[in-house]
């Protein structure tokens, strides 16, 4: 194949791959017709002048996972056809000025996972056709104004996993075609107003895992095409009322792991495409009426691991498409009987690890499609008559780790549970807490030796096996609830996730912390 170096493999498709620790310099001679060259996992420490001079047809060049620490400015001379250049996973600290001169066709430049300390405007001034620039995983502390001014065609810029402490509001101003901007895992404490104003075509903005405390009110007002906004794991303590008002295309918003104390009504406004909203691990203490009312298509709402002690009856107004609601690991003691009334499509509700002492009998009255209710680890002593009667699709009900009071009043619930044992799962059954003489005994098989008040035990059990639909159900107003359903965390397209199933109050829908990469 026009002379393939012994350390390399060459294919008929003009692809050359050179790998191995024994390689200490660019192998020669390389086939003149090579279009793709990969130099991987070698001990090459430097690139000298023009090592690729005779392979001018090269389109893709990958020099990755080597010991490369020094490159001569003319190393890539004569590669005018090169479209893809990766120098990722090396040991570069400095890029020589003019290194990319003459690479007029270059569209993708990957410099990630090196040790670059700085970049300068002159580095990329010749790369006018560049569409993708990957600089994540370096040691950049600042980006000088003008660094990207010539990259007017750039669509993807990754600056994540660096040491950026601030961003100039002018640094992105000429990137009108940019669709993806990633700044995750830096040390940004605030983003100046106007920083993203020129990014009119931006679709994804990743700001997670920084130290951002405040968001300017108009920070995203020019980003009408934004679809994915990642703000998780920052120090955001409040959201300006208008900060999300101009984001009609948004379909993914992550705010978990911040310091949000409150959410004002309409804060998430109009986002007709938003399907998931992740707000776990904040300090939210209450939910006012209509706080999510603009999110008409929302299907997943995660509010677990906050400090929510009060939910206004109209807090979930507008969420007619919601399927999953996670409220576990909060400080809920009571719930209004109408709080879930609007959630006609709800399938899973997670209320475990709260302080619920009672539940209103009508709490699930309009939520006929519920499939999973997690109420474990609350302070429930009993549940109202008929609370689950109409839930024909209910297949998972978790009631363990509550202080069930096994007196005569528990019989209707006990009888219903007897008939519906499969729904409770096999691992853990609810046990009695009081009276003390039956403590620890299974609620399902408990023998209640007390006379049963006739008012509570009609001839047909109040918790029938076959769901029934009373025309006008009357529910006594008592009891409480808490749940967890397994789901995965927000999957960012460059995120590594592990899912585990746990009952620990530190889990979020059985999810470990997302690690962005």
């Amino acid at each position: 194949y026009h002379g393939c170096p012994s350390e390399c493999t060459c294919s008929r498709a003009s692809q050359v791959e050179c790998t191995g620790a024994r390689i200490v310099a660019v192998p020669t001679p390389l086939p003149w017709n090579a279009m793709s060259l990969q130099i991987l996992n070698t001990h090459i420490t430097e690139l000298n002048e023009s090592p690729f001079l005779n392979i001018s047809a090269l389109i893709a060049l990958r020099i990755e996972k080597n010991e490369l620490s020094r490159i001569t400015p003319g190393a890539f001379r004569n590669l005018g056809s090169l479209r893809y250049l990766s120098l990722a996973n090396n040991k570069l600290q400095v890029l020589p000025i003019g290194l990319f001169q003459g690479l007029d066709s270059l569209e993708s430049l990957l410099l990630s996972s090196n040790q670059l300390l700085q970049i300068q405007p002159a580095h990329f001034s010749q790369c006018s056709n560049l569409k993708e620039l990957q600089l994540h995983g370096n040691h950049l502390e600042y980006i000088p104004d003008g660094a990207f001014d010539h990259l007017v065609g750039l669509t993807k810029l990754n600056l994540g996993k660096n040491s950026l402490t601030h961003i100039s509001p002018r640094v992105f101003q000429h990137l009108g075609n940019l669709q993806v901007l990633r700044l995750y895992e830096n040390r940004l404490t605030d983003i100046p107003m106007g920083t993203f104003d020129g990014l009119v075509n931006l679709q994804e903005l990743a700001l997670q895992q920084n130290q951002i405390g405040l968001l300017s009110p108009g920070l995203f007002h020019n980003n009408h095409n934004l679809q994915r906004l990642y703000l998780s794991n920052n120090h955001i303590s409040q959201l300006p009322p208008s900060v999300f008002m101009q984001l009609p295309q948004l379909n993914r918003l992550t705010l978990f792991g911040n310091s949000l104390k409150e959410l004002s009504p309409g804060i998430f406004g109009p986002m007709p495409n938003l399907r998931e909203l992740w707000l776990y691990d904040n300090h939210i203490s209450s939910l006012p009426d209509n706080v999510f009312s603009n999110l008409r298509q929302l299907q997943v709402l995660i509010l677990s691991r906050n400090q929510i002690s009060f939910i206004s009856p109209g807090a979930f107004n507008g969420l007619t498409e919601l399927r999953e609601l996670s409220l576990h690991t909060n400080a809920l003691q009571d719930l209004d009987g109408n709080v879930f009334r609007m959630l006609a499509n709800l399938q899973n509700i997670s209320l475990q690890n709260n302080r619920l002492r009672q539940l209103p009998g009508n709490i699930f009255a309009n939520v006929n499609g519920l499939m999973a209710i997690q109420l474990q680890n609350n302070q429930l002593e009993n549940l109202p008559l008929g609370i689950f009667d109409h839930l024909g699709k209910l297949c998972e009900l978790r009631l363990y780790d509550n202080p069930w009071r096994c007196d005569s009043d528990i019989l209707p619930l006990r009888n219903w549970l007897l008939l519906n044992q499969p729904r409770l799962g096999t691992d853990t059954v609810p046990v009695c807490f009081s009276p003390a003489n039956v403590r620890g005994q299974s609620l399902i098989i408990i023998n209640v030796n007390v006379a049963v008040p006739s008012v509570h035990v009609p001839e047909v059990p109040s918790y029938p096996e076959t769901p029934w639909y009373p025309d006008t159900p009357s529910y006594p107003d008592t009891t409480s609830v808490s749940s967890t359903t397994e789901l995965t965390s927000p999957v960012e397209d460059y995120t590594d996730l592990t899912t585990i199933q746990v009952t620990d109050d530190r889990s979020v829908w059985g999810m470990t912390q997302a690690q962005s990469g």
């Epitope: 003691q333 002492r357 363990y400 780790d401 691992d427 609810p430 003390a436 403590r439 620890g440 109050d505």
Partner: antibody
Framework: EVQLVESGGGLVQPGGSLRLSCAVS????????VHWVRQATGKGLEWLGV???????NYNSALMSRLTISKENAKSSVYLQMNSLRAGDTAMYYC??????????????WGQGTTVTVSS | DIVMTQSPDSLAVSLGERATINCKSS????????????LAWYQQKPGQSPKLLIY???TRESGVPDRFSGSGSGTDFTLTISSLQAEDVAVYYC????????FGGGTKVEIK
């Protein structure tokens, strides 16, 4: 007879971790919850967390990131794992349960405690 | 978190006299629907583990002498030892379980 016996205390280096055990007898861990409480010398009581009969856990929010409570029902043992120890974690560590009391978070049976000293 | 503040820090009372310990919570411990205050009192004698005396603010644990009584509601609570005995020398702690438990700082009761 109901008994709770703590073990695993001793001298730990700052930054290290500890794993304390609470061996229970006279009752089943599938029926009763077990709490962990600590007390620095001459100081007050501090609730650390609880593992309930079904395995759910609750933790003191100030310590939650460093604590894990687990159990092995068959071995009648409850464990407290604590990481990133500092001098302020030096204390007597107790496990306790709610055997007779009507108070769900009441602790009416206690172990004798095990001493943990964090020092270099 | 709910903060529990006890007063006084220490108390010296003659044998047979009344001892009164106060406990104040940073928020109400009353669950109005259950009509219960989620407050308990513990006694810890020197070198011993704590002992539960009173729960739900005023319900004595079985076996606890009736000279011990609890009162109060909402945020203000009191433990009273109507006639102090020598064996009552101890540190007394209040504990809330309205939210996840927190203890007061303790009150040391001694004989005058």
């Amino acid at each position: 007879e109901v008994q709770l016996v703590e073990s695993g205390g001793g001298l730990v280096q700052p930054g290290g971790s500890l794993r304390l055990s609470c061996a229970v007898s006279g009752f089943s861990l599938t029926s009763y919850g077990v709490h962990w409480v600590r007390q620095a010398t001459g100081k007050g009581l501090e609730w650390l967390g609880v593992i309930w009969a079904g395995g759910s856990t609750n933790y003191n929010s100030a310590l939650m990131s460093r604590l894990t409570i687990s159990k092995e029902n068959a071995k009648s043992s409850v464990y407290l794992q604590m990481n990133s120890l500092r001098a302020g974690d030096t204390a007597m560590y107790y496990c306790a349960t709610h055997m007779i009391t009507e108070d769900y978070y009441g602790m009416d049976y206690w172990g004798q405690g095990t001493t943990v000293t964090v020092s270099s | 978190d709910i903060v529990m503040t006890q007063s006084p820090d220490s108390l010296a009372v003659s044998l047979g006299e009344r001892a009164t310990i106060n406990c104040k919570s940073s928020q109400s411990l009353l669950n109005s629907r259950h009509r219960k205050n989620y407050l308990a009192w513990y006694q810890q004698k020197p070198g011993q583990s704590p002992k539960l005396l009173i729960y739900w603010a005023s319900t004595r644990e079985s076996g606890v002498p009736d000279r011990f009584s609890g009162s109060g509601s909402g945020t203000d609570f009191t433990l009273t030892i109507s006639s102090l005995q020598a064996e009552d020398v101890a540190v007394y702690y209040c504990k809330q379980s309205y939210n996840l438990p927190t203890f007061g700082g303790g009150t040391k009761v001694e004989i005058k």
